[in-house]
Interface confidence: low
């Protein structure tokens, strides 16, 4: 027999056996120019010495073979001897040691088993009802397929699907998504009606990412403030990344997991905006307020889970950066301004009363006064800060009011609201013996004191009623007593106290009189 | 016009079985894959199982295998599945779809219920 033609003979070996784990499999068999046909095949086993030889019945009851020796796969032409417009069964037999192993059958159509392509090109996928679809364009010229599918998980093996007949310009198939694992998709497509014509080669990967993404487990920490009033978010864990299957590691796209960082700027809440997306990896400063932030894990399929972190506001005072005039008209704030046409914010609340809206205040854009001064100013009327209690009051600038990570923190102190020379007139005053030329002077702490940073200090001032002489004794604000020394028996004093802050001078306290008893000796 | 009508709903108790059927009409049955889905109350859609045209391949979801299995036929134009050892979380409506355009029927009510 030639080569070149089917030999309608009885091969050169005994009978297949069909049994073996071993052998030839996944024969397949089709068309591949007008009148060329081409036939491959697997072979299991170790491969020396092994000859191949693929078998052919046809319609008529005629069987052939044709030998390839140790080759896995043939061509042929329509003048080989094999009818191609007809149906025809074919099976390879292999031949070693003096042992043959047989491949299943395949019947088909020669002239129409054409060489199907597996999907190309862009796999678009969705989510429908639960499950996954993918669709994609079909291959010029291959309208009407068979597709299968076959997906594995990071710790599963490929599992076999069918997505039924297609028969239009785009092919879709149904597939089961995973809830919380990532799972690796390939598809493959055989011409439709023709059981058995060989399918395409498998698809690239298509990584699919859980239907749920990952909780993201990622932790923070918030640096000082710096002096230029912003503090830095930094991040102390990185979210665990997803298990993939063995085909979607690598830059594989589809199965990502993005992670976003939302900020929620809680106070200051008059500005225009109070909350901002950005990518996890862009770790934002921010001003001494305080925020929510939020991790959000997205993945093709919209977002997951996310989780919350409360940072709480700076605490840090620095008490003398802000001063306060109170004038007839109203009372202006001045502290130290920033940039040219920068916008501030200011934001005050009475001490006690942390979990009640702030009151905020938003200045037009506004340039450093001839003293390098910014200002804000109100009317009596308006009654801000009028009542007389210790109020916190914090500032916060930005060149870019809309821009909710370009804000920084100016200044964060106390203010006495109201009359606060009055309502800080130390009380209960009362004068002791201390020895035979002291007294010891006490009294109830100033109002003030309960305002961090506002009490500068007390002055004792006691005046000789005699000779109309007056001492003053500066005393920390921290204390609430001093002793007076050097005083005479027998004359008569009068002390009185008073509460000042860095730009106020207080009124004094109603004065006391005492006088140190002359000694008499028996 | 393509209409697919379910039937053979009902209530049945825990352990129980049934056997949903759908006729086929207005479309060449036999070229075409079927699924089965199934909706319980106050939730989405969820897909049960899958014959291939000539019904040699079948699938089903996790959850129902080894207990629900589905059939097909081609000569009458029917699509069948036999529900055992059925459970309360099987109560649903059950349609039967058309696996190439979604196209599905009016739904049959399985209540499972002691």
């Known amino acids: 027999c030639r080569t070149s033609e089917c030999c309608f003979q009885d091969p050169p070996y005994s009978d297949a056996d069909s049994g073996s784990a071993s052998g030839p499999r996944d024969l397949s068999c089709y068309r591949i120019s007008s009148a060329g046909y081409e036939c491959s095949w697997q072979y299991e086993g170790p491969t020396a010495g092994v000859s191949h030889f693929l078998r052919c019945c046809l319609s008529s009851g005629r069987c052939c073979y044709f030998a390839t020796g140790s080759a896995t796969r043939l061509q042929f032409s329509d003048q080989a001897g094999v009818s191609v417009l007809h149906t025809v069964t074919l099976w390879v037999e292999s031949w070693a040691r003096n042992r043959t192993e047989k491949s299943p059958e395949v019947t088909l159509q020669l002239y129409k088993s054409v060489k199907y392509k597996p999907p190309l090109g862009d796999i678009k996928v969705s989510k429908l009802a639960g499950q996954l679809r993918m669709e994609w364009e079909t291959p010029d010229n291959q309208v009407g397929a068979e597709v299968q599918f076959r997906h594995r998980t990071p710790s599963s093996s490929w599992k076999l699907g069918d997505c039924g007949p297609q028969d239009d310009d785009t092919e879709s198939c149904l597939c089961p998504l995973e809830m919380n694992v990532a799972q690796e998709f390939q598809l493959r497509r055989r011409r439709l009606g023709s059981q058995g014509s060989s399918w395409s080669k498998w698809s690239s990967p298509v990584c699919v990412p859980p239907e749920n993404p990952p909780q993201p487990q990622v932790r923070f920490s918030v640096e000082q403030l710096g002096r230029d009033g912003r503090r830095r978010l930094t991040l102390k864990e990185q979210p665990t990344q997803l298990e993939l299957p063995e085909g979607c590691q690598g830059p594989a796209p589809g199965v990502e997991v993005t992670y976003q960082l939302q900020l929620h700027m809680l106070s200051c809440p008059c500005k225009a905006k109070a909350t901002r997306t950005l990518p996890l990896e862009k770790m934002p400063y921010l001003s001494g307020a305080a925020y929510n932030v939020a991790v959000i894990s997205s993945n093709r399929f919209g977002p997951g889970p996310n989780q919350t972190w409360h940072i709480p506001a700076d605490t840090h005072t620095e008490p003398v950066a802000l001063n306060i005039s109170v004038g007839t008209n109203g009372t202006t704030m001045y502290w130290p301004a920033r940039a040219q046409s920068t916008t501030y914010c200011i934001e005050w609340q009475p001490v006690g009363q942390e979990g009640s809206l702030a009151t905020c205040n938003l200045t037009a854009p506004q340039d450093p006064d001839p003293a390098g001064m910014a200002t804000y100013s109100w009317s009596r009327e308006s009654g801000a800060m009028g009542q007389e209690k210790c109020y916190h009051i914090t500032i916060f600038a930005s060149a870019h009011p809309k821009k909710l990570t370009l804000w920084s923190t100016v200044l964060s102190t106390y203010h006495f609201g109201g009359n606060a020379s009055a309502a800080g007139t130390p009380h209960h005053v009362s004068v002791k013996n201390h020895s035979l030329d002291s007294v010891s002077v006490d009294w109830a702490p100033s109002l003030l004191s309960t305002c961090p940073g506002v009490l500068k200090e007390y002055v004792v001032r006691c005046r000789d009623e005699d000779s109309n002489q007056v001492s003053e004794h500066p005393v920390q604000p921290t204390e609430t007593q001093v002793t007076l020394s050097d005083l005479r028996a027998g004359v008569a004093y009068t002390v009185q106290v008073r509460a000042d802050t860095a730009w106020l001078r207080g009124a004094w306290s109603q004065p006391q009189r005492f006088s140190i008893k002359v000694q008499v000796s028996d | 016009q393509l209409q697919l009508v379910e039937s053979g709903g009902g209530l049945v108790q825990p352990g129980g079985s049934l056997r949903l059927s759908c006729a086929a009409s207005?479309?060449?049955?036999?070229?075409?894959?079927m699924s089965w889905v199934r909706q319980a109350p106050g939730k989405g859609l969820e897909w049960v199982s899958y014959?291939?045209?000539?019904?040699?391949?079948?699938t089903y979801v996790d959850f129902v295998k080894g207990r629900f299995t589905i059939s097909r036929d081609n000569a009458k134009n029917m699509l069948y599945l036999q529900m055992n050892s059925l459970k309360p979380e099987d109560t649903a409506v059950y349609y039967c779809?058309?696996?190439?355009?979604?196209?599905r029927g009016q739904g049959t009510q399985v209540t499972v219920s002691s």
């Open positions: 779809v058309h696996a190439a355009d979604g196209s």
């Open positions: 014959i291939s045209a000539g019904g040699g391949t079948t």
């Open positions: 207005g479309f060449t049955f036999s070229s075409y894959g």
